[in-house]
């Protein structure tokens, strides 16, 4: 009888350990990716940024994948997504082609099943960066809560990529899972 | 036998209560600190802001410590950190020393073990606040997901602190723990 | 005896299932509301935005209620609140009444019990949108961690509502519950 009770208890322990593992101990996905400025496009138009660090300095990733410039969702869920994009110009970098700039970021979601891209969040500003000042700076922050499915991809598009601040504290984006889909 | 079964059940209950306490019911750390404007430094250079409220109005703290102007981590984990910093100037406050301003925020992490400070996030803008307008305003928001260890300290640095908006809804920073470190 | 043991086990299972449901499986409240631009007030003064989508595109809501232009809390807790507000103007829309603008957002909390409204977060900028440029754009992002009680209401106020960008990726606000109140 005592042996049977212990078996019952083990079942209880085991099933609950499974539940606990799934509900809490199973690592919730996250990513914080910082700009890799060694390969920034040259144009002033809107471009997708494909070079990001995922494993140095503040950059990190867990239970998500970074591939071909995109953050890939491995686990269905509701995620908080965010991006911080800094632009800067110093007169030593040369003369700007135009002093009227559109400094923008677009956080996009792509579904492989339905090969289409949709903008989840956008932010930015038009700026007049006159030659009267030797230094100019501007940062954008966006964030929001989105349902993401396994296999979906998050990417970042910006205008005027050659003006990006290459510091890891300046230009980054990320995500963390907040809860499951019901 | 029945007594033995109850003891077994109590063990199951007890161990799971411990697990539940650790995994869910143990309060997850957080803080939302609002500016204490009674002690804002003057000058236009970059300074660390040391005066924040932690227990009035919207300000609150739990399982973190506020000491010497720094938010101290008591529990290892991955945290979402954020800051909202508002700058403003009204002509009744007097003439600005310069109309070309760098309005910036830096969210920094200091480790006591290795006495060094690192910037986790930065944001802001250069602004031209001309005398043609009687009122000027600008806000910065930054946020990101970071691994923090017990004993590490988070602090806020800004440029032009004398231009800070002293309202609790304007100038604040905070953190909340999202998940454990694996 | 064996039947009694099973009953004990069922009690253990049942109580833990309750705990698990409450602690994890009970859906944590959230909302992501996107601007409904069919009913945006005119004028340049501060107005409350009452028209938001909650069930189309990126907009969604769970365990919270949207009513009369306000996001109503149904479950006590600590929530992360956020808003992203975009303003834009193209010369084809006509001349601005003034080139000096205050583009602001206020995230407010109203308690029905104590009929008063308080600003939780604010952000924005004064802007000079001159006629030299055919297009102007500016975005604001704010976010913070707040204790909300069941029945409290969150609303969004902005200045210059007629300049709002009506895209769902541009102008939105939201909330998600992070943890219980101790």
């Amino acid at each position: 009888g005592s042996q049977h009770i212990r078996a019952e208890k083990a079942m209880v322990d085991g099933s609950w350990l499974d539940l606990a593992k799934r509900s809490k101990l199973e690592a919730q996905p996250f990513a914080h990716l910082t700009i890799n400025a060694t390969d920034i496009p040259s144009g002033s138009h809107k471009v997708s940024l494909s070079s990001w660090y995922h494993d140095r300095g503040w950059a990190k990733i867990s239970n998500m994948t970074f591939s071909n410039g995109k953050l890939i969702v491995n686990q269905d869920g509701f995620y908080y997504l965010y991006a911080n994009i800094c632009f800067r110009h110093h007169e030593t970098s040369g003369d700007l082609a135009t002093e009227y700039l559109q400094l923008m970021v677009y956080v996009t979601k792509t579904s492989i099943k339905i090969p289409s891209s949709h903008t989840l969040m956008k932010g930015g500003s038009t700026k007049y960066w006159s030659g009267n000042s030797e230094f100019h700076f501007y940062s954008i922050n966006v964030g929001g809560f989105f349902k993401l499915r396994s296999g979906e991809e998050i990417s970042i598009e910006v205008s005027n990529p050659s003006l990006l601040d290459p510091d890891q504290d300046a230009t980054y984006f990320g995500a963390f899972k907040v809860r499951d889909i019901d | 036998g029945s007594q033995h079964i109850r003891a077994e059940k109590a063990m199951v209950d007890g161990s799971w209560l411990d697990l539940a306490k650790r995994s869910k019911l143990e309060a997850q750390p957080f803080a939302h600190l609002t500016i204490n404007a009674t002690d804002i430094p003057s000058g236009s250079h970059k300074v660390s802001l040391s005066s924040w409220y932690h227990d009035r109005g919207w300000a609150k703290i739990s399982n973190m410590t506020f000491s010497n102007g720094k938010l101290i981590v008591n529990q290892d984990g991955f945290y979402y950190l954020y800051a909202n910093i508002c700058f403003r100037h009204h002509e009744t406050s007097g003439d600005l020393a310069t109309e070309y301003l760098q309005l910036m925020v830096y969210v920094t992490k200091t480790s006591i073990k290795i006495p060094s400070s690192h910037t986790l996030m930065k944001g802001g803008s250069t602004k031209y606040w001309s005398g043609n307008s009687e009122f000027h305003f600008y806000s910065i928001n930054v946020g990101g997901f970071f691994k923090l260890r017990s004993g590490e300290e988070i602090s806020i640095e800004v440029s032009n602190p004398s231009l800070l908006d002293p309202d609790q809804d304007a100038t604040y920073f905070g953190a909340f723990k999202v998940r454990d470190i694996d | 005896g064996s039947q009694h043991i099973r009953a004990e086990k069922a009690m253990v299972d049942g109580s833990w299932l309750d705990l698990a449901k409450r602690s994890k499986l009970e859906a944590q409240p959230f909302a992501h509301l996107t601007i409904n631009a069919t009913d945006i007030p005119s004028g340049s003064h501060k107005v409350s935005l009452s028209s938001w989508y909650h069930d189309r595109g990126w907009a969604k809501i769970s365990n919270m209620t949207f009513s009369n232009g306000k996001l109503i809390v149904n479950q006590d807790g600590f929530y992360y609140l956020y808003a992203n507000i975009c303003f834009r103007h193209h010369e084809t829309s006509g001349d601005l009444a003034t080139e000096y603008l205050q583009l602001m957002v206020y995230v407010t909390k109203t308690s029905i019990k104590i009929p008063s409204s308080h600003t939780l977060m604010k952000g924005g900028s004064t802007k000079y949108w001159s006629g030299n440029s055919e297009f102007h754009f500016y975005s604001i992002n704010v976010g913070g961690f707040f204790k909300l009680r069941s029945g409290e209401e969150i609303s969004i106020e902005v200045s210059n509502p007629s300049l709002l960008d009506p895209d769902q990726d541009a102008t939105y606000f939201g909330a998600f519950k992070v943890r219980d109140i101790d």
Epitope: S42, G43, S44, H45, D95, A97, Y100 | - | -
Partner: antibody, heavy 121, light 107 residues
Framework: QVQLVESGGGVVQPGRSLRLSCAAS????????MHWVRQAPDKGLEWVAV????????YYADSVKGRFTISRDNSKNTLYLQMNSLRAEDTAVYYC????????WGYGMDVWGQGTTVTVS | DIQMTQSPSTLSASVGDRVTITCRAS??????LAWYQQKPGKAPKLLIY???SLESGVPSRFSGSGSGTEFTLTISSLQPDDFATYYC?????????FGQGTKVEIK
């Protein structure tokens, strides 16, 4: 592939006008400044004019200022050079060229067309 | 306007030679200098920008150096495909000018 194709050249009498076009493909035309450069027979290269990616800023060599106008239509991926009051010394092969950097001046011209010949006589 | 003076005007060399072409600006242009190669009947081709940055796809035997008023283009080991005319081009304050060219011919 990235390509620029000039057209509109020909023989014209002094004092008359001509409009050159440059059709761009293979890159985001609206993201880059564009130049016109010319080369007289058996001579070196001479810069003529430049236009920023958004059309807001344009600059000209002294030799053509007031006579030539550079413009673009980003919807058609096309650059133009309107040449008025043409002179014999304007005889040359005219090249359009793309700025290497869209944001900054000064980085050089990384894509060139094959050129179109203008003869003023 | 800033004048650009290239030297020599003509250079005779053999395959495998190390070749250096100089370009002088009439006033400082910082590092805002580019080098181009042009073959008869063809459009110019960008080799070097910002004085020393090698354009994508250009062989590494080409290199640029200098700043201020004095700049050089070096071909470390001349190849048969390198016989052409080379131009420097400066940028300064919304004005662009080319040097008169250096013709590299077979000795």
């Amino acid at each position: 592939q990235v390509q620029l194709v000039e057209s509109g050249g020909g023989v014209v009498q002094p004092g008359r006008s001509l409009r050159l076009s440059c059709a761009a493909s293979g890159f985001t035309f609206s993201g880059y400044g564009m130049h016109w450069v010319r080369q007289a027979p058996d001579k070196g290269l001479e810069w003529v004019a430049v236009l920023s990616y958004d059309g807001t800023n344009k600059y000209y060599a002294d030799s053509v200022k007031g006579r030539f106008t550079i413009s673009r239509d980003n919807s058609k991926n096309t650059l133009y050079l309107q040449m008025n009051s043409l002179r014999a010394e304007d005889t040359a092969v005219y090249y359009c060229a793309k700025c290497l950097s869209g944001t900054y001046w000064g980085y050089g011209m990384d894509v060139w067309g094959q050129g179109t010949t203008v003869t003023v006589s | 306007d800033i004048q650009m003076t290239q030297s020599p005007s003509t250079l005779s060399a053999s395959v495998g030679d190390r070749v250096t072409i100089t370009c002088r600006a009439s006033q400082s242009i910082s590092s805002w200098l580019a080098w181009y190669q042009q073959k008869p009947g063809k459009a110019p081709k960008l080799l070097i920008y910002k004085a020393s940055s090698l354009e994508s796809g250009v062989p590494s035997r080409f290199s640029g150096s200098g700043s201020g008023t004095e700049f050089t283009l070096t071909i470390s080991s001349l190849q048969p495909d390198d016989f052409a005319t080379y131009y420097c081009q400066q940028y300064n304050s919304y004005s662009w000018t080319f040097g008169q060219g250096t013709k590299v011919e077979i000795k």
